[in-house]
Amino acid sequence: IWELKKDVYVVELDWYPDAPGEMVVLTCDTPEEDGITWTLDQSSEVLGSGKTLTIQVKEFGDAGQYTCHKGGEVLSHSLLLLHKKEDGIWSTDILKDQKEPKNKTFLRCEAKNYSGRFTCWWLTTISTDLTFSVKSSRGSSDPQGVTCGAATLSAERVRGDNKEYEYSVECQEDSACPAAEESLPIEVMVDAVHKLKYENYTSSFFIRDIIKPDPPKNLQLKPLKNSRQVEVSWEYPDTWSTPHSYFSLTFCVQVQGKSKREKKDRVFTDKTSATVICRKNASISVRAQDRYYSSSWSEWASVPCS
Amino acid sequence: RNLPVATPDPGMFPCLHHSQNLLRAVSNMLQKARQTLEFYPCTSEEIDHEDITKDKTSTVEACLPLELTKNESCLNSRETSFITNGSCLASRKTSFMMALCLSSIYEDLKMYQVEFKTMNAKLLMDPKRQIFLDQNMLAVIDELMQALNFNSETVPQKSSLEEPDFYKTKIKLCILLHAFRIRAVTIDRVMSYLNAS
């Protein structure tokens, strides 16, 4: 058993049929010694008396808020949460496996630039009695500071019969140099509590590997005389690291109709302009990627050909 | 500690092309190592990230773009002194700071070159003959060093009398390649910045 926060404790249980469970001793936070009784949750049934209460925690019915009283007055609370371990593996029931970029990916993180600021998000089908807390650091043995905000519900989607909820959090490395060469990864730890179930999820990454620039901005078209070609130009996104001659991007320019199966024109360039063939009912799209370290491409920025 | 704005004009900056070739060569070699050594811990997640130039050179700090010198987090650098007579410095007006930056890059390349050559000698003794260093990568390192053209003491190639542990050597190769790729990215950024300034 360990303390998650003040008066909240996590009991780690091997979860299998007829498991013996864990013996837990609760101590009432009071100078009083006599006349103390214990109850669980809203029940008035007295579980025991005395300054300490010894319980055998085997299942969720044994978890909850234990309260010690004296003469009708509440002295203190201890909330017990369960953390299940099945076949040596901690449960991951609360969050959905996003399966990208690989199986067992529960947390996904992205950074728009090298400033040390990043966003992580996760998915769940649970809508109520759910809380998250997020901690982060650079490295684990001698951790350097990363400050994370509160996790917030950022999107709701309907997936078949189920509703899916996306939560996200923003974090900022306390002293980040955009030009630095990372040798220690960022560690992100998310504590998830659903009712009386506790789970924790972690992700480890280098900022350089989670870079995904914003789409290029200010796309403009200029038709070329006596030709089907148009010159398309754009600018670096405002959120990208500066100077741009040091933090350079490369671009993919594509002309395509509404369907992915349609024919297309595609060209890659390090410049902020390109010449392509425009077709009726097609659109020109441009996306960006770090020129020197191939992490993710940005989303497309698009303008219609017409 | 930072790159000045007044730097060579693009036509006189031969190092950019060589640095692009360097990044390409090390990326290809790393990809080859990851494929060939698929049953070894050779991915970014599996290896320890070591920097053989740590406390010996200060490339990131010495080559910091002017715009980033206002960032306190970028300025906790180690001061190191270097020789300053490189041929990528296309004009005599080139500042001492830029010379310091380019000589730091030269020292990096020299250290990696020695490590890679020593390692290749060991890998050539491996009866499995599983992986060797790409000669193209070694040649590209050499070309960039020649373009930088700094006079520097020759570092003797390390020779080892004991029987090499090929498993450890291959893991060290992965560690070296990952670190060198990261440094090659920095070098490419620096050359691009100098070329544009």
Partner: antibody
Amino acid sequence: QVQLVQSGAEVKKPGSSVKVSCKASGGTFSDYYLHWSRQAPGQGLEWMGWIDPENGDTEYAPKFQGRVTITADESTSTAYMELSSLRSEDTAVYYCARNKELRYFDVWGQGTLVTVSS
Amino acid sequence: DIVMTQSPLSLPVTPGEPASISCRASQSISINLHWYQQKPGQAARLLIAFASQSISGVPSRFSGSGSGTDFTLTISSLQPEDFATYYCQQSNSFPLTFGQGTKVEIK
């Protein structure tokens, strides 16, 4: 199985024209760009131009502008390349090729030898 | 027009050995570079698109690398059916242009 089948070899006099055909099978004809290139004896490949069979849009290499005409007949899934004012330097193997991507070719025809000789 | 220069023009190789063909562009073309294989009397075949993207159905022994002006096609271990002529082609700008070709021959 996508295939491009070209018409047979031709012998032409200088100053005349030649029209080479390229019949496509497999896939929808108008879903692809169709290109023509050529290779003179002992020389490299030379791109001549493309057509979008869907709308008849064409673009030609400046070198051939005014002498080459590329057309397409959707009903027979056939593209044509006509080269006029032939000269001996036009002796070459002419290839058609296609792709959904405009700028490179994932399927090629077998080639048609055109000999220009007086 | 962008001039594409291949080297060597002829490459004698022993079967089972690796082979590398170089292609250089007269100006930077990013990764807009494609490789083809052609055998006498046969249709050409696309091997690699955009410098390094493998093509479905093409054996994994064919790989491409490069960007900017310098590109390489590598065949890791030459098989008897790989003896042919190889062409690079740039798609950075029109007119599209090809290299002169590299003939890979049995040593």
